[in-house]
């Protein structure tokens, strides 16, 4: 029950997150004009990844797309790429996770296949969330840099006679939507990965078998491989004798997680 709930919740959280990433990517308010101390402005500028808009106090709003590709800043292109990669990975992850849901029966799909699919979608969600967070953070960093640069040259003019007010831009709503959405997708992905562990079919626990050899007696444990690689409890340089008396299952025998359904 806990696994199904964790998987279902992970799916829903990721779904909301990806919807948020798509919304943020499409939004026009990635950067908005800084209004200083004046909340009322006659002309309000805001920009997205795909177009820039101007809203006059008259209510008239005009948006213009960035019809050039080569003329755009490399950072903006990078942010676009990160957001698109995030959306694509998230969409694929959603598709995979639908078939991986424990509550949905598709033919005679084994639990091991569902576990693998859950893990795959979980990883995809994690990467998708990270892409969104990275994209939004890169854009935010770009804004902060430009903000302080334009503050430094707030007014430029010839001998102070003619002044040009430089438009400063600050964080737009899309950045916060993107951060939250990326975070949700990441959390959803982690939940899917956790659910995967519980979905994996439980291996048989073999008891230790004693073999009596001539001259001396050594107990051969299935955990010998683990101990020799330093992942088990035996991390010291003790020699583990392996006489080959091991079944195939024993080679990959890890302590199984018991899921109480």
């Amino acid at each position: 029950m806990a696994v199904t709930a964790c998987q279902g919740l992970g799916f829903v959280v990721s779904l909301i997150g990806i919807a948020g990433i798509i919304a943020a990517t499409c939004m026009d308010q990635w950067s908005t004009q800084d209004l200083y101390n004046n909340p009322v402005t006659a002309v309000f500028n805001y920009q997205g990844l795909w177009r820039s808009c101007v809203r006059e106090s008259s209510g008239f709003t005009e948006c213009r797309g960035y019809f050039t590709l080569l003329g755009l800043p490399a950072m903006l292109q990078a942010v676009r790429a990160l957001m698109i990669v995030g959306i694509v990975l998230g969409a694929i992850g959603l598709l995979v996770s639908i078939f991986a849901l424990k509550c949905i029966r598709i033919g005679s799909m084994e639990d091991s296949a569902k576990a693998n699919m859950t893990l795959t979608s979980g990883i995809m969600f994690i990467v998708s969330g990270l892409c969104a967070i990275a994209g939004v953070s890169v854009f935010a960093n770009m804004l902060v840099t430009n903000f302080w640069m334009s503050t430094a040259n707030m007014y430029t003019g010839m001998g102070g006679m003619v002044q040009t007010v430089q438009t400063r831009y600050t964080f737009g709503a899309a950045l916060f939507v993107g951060w939250v959405a990326g975070g949700l997708t990441l959390i959803g992905g982690v939940m899917m990965c956790i659910a995967c562990r519980g979905l994996a079919p439980e291996e048989t626990n073999y008891k230790a078998v004693s073999y009596h050899a001539s001259g001396h007696s050594v107990a051969y444990k299935p955990g010998g491989f683990k101990a020799s690689t330093g992942f088990g409890s035996n991390t010291k340089n003790k020699k583990i004798y392996d006489g080959g008396a091991r079944t195939e299952d024993e080679v990959q025998s890890y302590p199984s997680k018991h899921d109480y359904v």
Partner: antibody
Framework: EVQLVQSGAEVKKPGASVKVSCKAS????????MHWVKQRPGQRLEWIGM????????NYNEKFKGKATLTLDKSASTAYMELSSLRSEDTAVYYC???????????WGQGTTVTVSS | DIVMTQSPDSLAVSLGERATINCKSS????????????LTWYQQKPGQPPKLLIY???TRESGVPDRFSGSGSGTDFTLTISSLQAEDVAVYYC?????????FGQGTKLEIK
């Protein structure tokens, strides 16, 4: 046809108050900002402030804060401007004007002359 | 506040001749977001309210004769009447429509020579 009809001329004593009205017709009153402009004889036009008939939000020129108060009656499609503590320099023609694309005033009231005289 | 300065204060032009009125702002009225100049021109005849002629520095309001044209960018703007008619006698004002408070020029009185 869009029309902005203002109230008639007023003669007031110094220290008194006056309320000028501007009735709008021929368009959706709540969709456009209503602005008020002052014009003293032989002087340049001065922007007083604005009010949005839908939200009721206002924005004033610092120079007129405390002097002018903008209100409205949505049901009557009428905007009001009250001028308080009148002085001789408040003698002017006051216009209401509708803001349109380009932040320009496309329709103006006929003007209300306020004369402050003792 | 943005200061708008018009020149000349008064202008006398013969009928059919070209009339040019200049307007200078203390700050740029060019908005980088849409590359539009937020400058408006009005015509005011005695006893009447101002009439909108041109907005965005060069866009003529509907119903305004095409002899009226606006030009300029940033801080320097011009209103041109290509062929003066008798009904064009009026006071012309330029207005900053870019930042609050909106400000107007002192006006240019256009007369017939």
């Amino acid at each position: 046809e869009v029309q902005l009809v203002q109230s008639g001329a007023e003669v007031k004593k110094p220290g008194a108050s006056v309320k000028v009205s501007c009735k709008a017709s021929g368009y959706t009153f709540t969709s456009y900002w209503m602005h008020w402009v002052k014009q003293r004889p032989g002087q340049r036009l001065e922007w007083i402030g604005m009010i949005h008939p839908n939200s009721g939000s206002t924005n004033y020129n610092e120079k007129f804060k405390g002097k002018a108060t903008l209100t409205l009656d949505k049901s009557a499609s009428t905007a009001y401007m009250e001028l308080s503590s009148l002085r001789s320099e408040d003698t002017a023609v006051y216009y209401c004007a509708r803001l349109k694309t380009g932040n320009s005033f496309d329709y103006w009231g006929q003007g209300t002359t306020v004369t402050v005289s003792s | 506040d943005i200061v708008m300065t018009q020149s000349p204060d008064s202008l006398a032009v013969s009928l059919g001749e070209r009339a040019t009125i200049n307007c200078k702002s203390s700050q740029s009225l060019l908005n980088s977001g849409n590359q539009k100049n937020y400058l408006t021109w009005y015509q005011q005849k005695p006893g009447q309210p101002p009439k909108l002629l041109i907005y965005w520095a060069s866009t003529r309001e509907s119903g305004v004769p095409d002899r009226f044209s606006g030009s300029g960018s940033g801080t320097d703007f011009t209103l041109t009447i290509s062929s003066l008619q008798a009904e064009d006698v009026a006071v012309y004002y330029c207005q900053n429509a870019y930042t609050y408070p909106f400000t107007f020029g002192q006006g240019t009185k256009l007369e017939i020579k």
